[in-house]
């Protein structure tokens, strides 16, 4: 029966068919569906979808939707069809499909699963055992990211105090979009007794640079010149340094923020690749001065803004005065 345009726009379309859900990799959940049966012939079909909590509404012509999500909780997608991109148009009856996390006692799942990307060269994940777990549980960590063809198993499981952990190579690739993606993580046990735990680690967060390495301290008049090696793998706009100078006589502790700075003064080894320099003003040369440096990523490059590197090894210059 022919309906004019106005009618087909307001008419509710039939529901989508064959809505199904599957998991790819570790944490990529994909829903697919077929167009509704008996939709108006003059209707240009669009699909309205949102997750169970009415989050992330989307209107699109594709018959699929995917999300990267740690599968620690049940997640549901509701899908309907409509004839326009208008959000105010009433879609068809919504069809829902849910996916549940792997089975198991929630109290057995590991907790505090978190990962840090060290110096853009390896990722180190750590976790605490679940409450209902035997002390001799053998854990396995699996990981996946876009530059891997398949899921990998982490080989270097270790224990540090109460925490278990595992580290794996993850080198920043030149592809500029590499850091826009995430690493998918799953931890379970070899025997299959514990409930698996999942995490998604965005590569723009949790980045911890290696500490700098102080190469040289020297005095020129009342200024202290500090030269250090920068951590590898970072571009200069993405790091800044904190230089701490402690004076044994005055017991002062001065802290300076430093932009990566070229070594242009004659006091420094010049044009040495990957080194930075800084001049600390007004330092007493006849007292003992101890310097250490740490480095942090810039929030415009990496979003996690609380991770400093460890401190460099200290280096001292000057003479410790005898107490009289």
């Amino acid at each position: 029966d022919y309906k004019d345009d106005d009618e087909s726009r307001t008419e509710t379309q039939p529901p989508v068919t064959n809505l199904s859900v599957s998991v790819e990799n570790l944490c990529t959940v994909i829903w697919t569906w077929n167009p509704p049966e008996g939709a108006s012939s003059n209707c240009s079909l669009w699909y309205f979808s949102h997750f169970g909590d009415k989050q992330d509404k989307k209107i699109a012509p594709e018959t699929r939707r995917s999300i990267e999500v740690p599968l620690n909780e049940r997640i549901c997608l509701q899908v309907g069809s409509q004839c326009s991109t208008n959000e105010s148009e009433k879609p068809s009856i919504l069809v829902e499909k849910c996916i549940s996390p792997p089975e198991g006692d929630p109290e057995s799942a590991v907790t505090e699963l978190q990962c840090i990307w060290h110096n853009l060269s390896y990722m180190k994940c750590s976790w605490l055992p679940g409450r209902n777990t035997s002390p001799d549980t053998n854990y396995t960590l699996y990981y996946w990211h876009r530059s891997l063809e398949k899921i990998h198993q982490c080989e270097n499981i270790f224990r540090e105090g109460q925490y278990f952990g595992c580290s794996f190579d993850l080198t920043k690739v030149k592809d500029s979009s590499f850091e826009q993606h995430s690493v998918q993580i799953m931890v379970k046990d070899n025997a299959g007794k514990i409930k698996p735990s999942f995490n998604i680690v965005p590569l723009t967060s949790r980045v911890k640079p290696d500490p700098p390495h102080i190469k040289n301290l020297s005095f020129h008049n009342d200024d202290l010149y500090v030269q250090w090696e920068n951590p590898q793998n970072f571009i200069s706009r993405c790091l800044f340094y904190e230089v701490e100078v402690n004076n044994s006589q005055t017991e002062t502790h001065n802290v300076f923020y430093v932009q990566e700075a070229k070594c242009e003064n004659p006091e420094f080894e010049r044009n040495v690749e990957n080194t930075s320099c800084f001049m600390v003003p007004g330092v007493l040369p006849d007292t003992l001065n101890t310097v250490r440096i740490r480095v942090k990523t810039n929030k415009l490059c990496y979003e996690d803004d609380k991770l400093w590197s460890n401190w460099s090894q200290e280096m001292s210059i000057g003479k410790k005065r005898n107490s009289t």
Epitope: F240, Q259, N298, K299, D305
Partner: antibody
Framework: EVQLVQSGAEVKKPGESLKISCKGS????????IGWVRQMPGKGLEWMGV????????RYSPSFQGQVTISADKSISTAYLQWSSLKASDTAMYYC???????????WGQGTLVTVSS | EIVLTQSPGTLSLSPGERATLSCRAS???????LAWYQQKPGQAPRLLIY???SRATGIPDRFSGSGSGTDFTLTISRLEPEDFAVYYC?????FGQGTKVEIK
């Protein structure tokens, strides 16, 4: 001495295009970010976006994304802020400022007043 | 997106008094990124404090910054006549709305 010198005041009509400039001197222009900040009449400061002249990497505040373009010419140590089609609501004082990697704006230009009126 | 809320909106004090300005973040932020500025009418802003507590070059020691997490404070120990101005806190792409310090 670090200095940022901005181009002069502009009076424009709605729909016109505009490009204002900010010339840096007294420091390594390619080693620091340049940020742009808007201040509408009688209002507070709004962060528009930044550029790193060393590699022309830019970041915009969501409210200004697509509204303006930030660029730089490192050969003449100059950063630019441009509009393709001005609106009356773009009337404001625009400041450029030097930004080290920890995000504070440590040296400021004198400001460029842009007035858009029919 | 992080929101910085400054209080009070206006602070009426006399020269010689102590001024305490507050800046509260909607979520925890790194103190490395928190800065304070002073702006006088008809002038560009001037950086006072960076890294929450480090004084910028040439800033008198009556200005001090403190705080961490979500709560940050700018203190002017003894107000001088030239300190009456508007003060802004900032963290990268976010500025607070400003606190005006005016003469009582």
């Amino acid at each position: 001495e670090v200095q940022l010198v901005q181009s002069g005041a502009e009076v424009k009509k709605p729909g016109e295009s505009l490009k204002i400039s900010c010339k840096g001197s007294g420091y390594s222009f390619t080693s620091y970010w340049i940020g742009w900040v808007r201040q509408m009449p009688g209002k507070g400061l709004e962060w528009m976006g930044v550029i790193y002249p060393g590699d022309s990497y830019t970041r915009y505040s969501p409210s200004f994304q697509g509204q303006v373009t930030i660029s730089a010419d490192k050969s003449i140590s100059t950063a630019y802020l441009q509009w393709s089609s001005l609106k009356a609501s773009d009337t404001a004082m625009y400041y450029c400022a030097r930004m080290p990697n920890w995000g504070s704006l440590d040296s400021w230009g004198q400001g460029t007043l842009v007035t858009v009126s029919s | 997106e992080i929101v910085l809320t400054q209080s009070p909106g206006t602070l009426s004090l006399s020269p010689g008094e102590r001024a305490t300005l507050s800046c509260r973040a909607s979520q925890s932020i790194s103190s490395s990124y928190l800065a304070w500025y002073q702006q006088k009418p008809g002038q560009a802003p001037r950086l006072l404090i960076y890294g929450a507590s480090s004084r910028a070059t040439g800033i008198p020691d009556r200005f001090s910054g403190s705080g961490s997490g979500t709560d940050f404070t700018l203190t002017i120990s003894r107000l001088e006549p030239e300190d009456f101005a508007v003060y802004y806190c900032q963290q990268y792409e976010t500025f607070g709305q400003g606190t005006k310090v005016e003469i009582k």
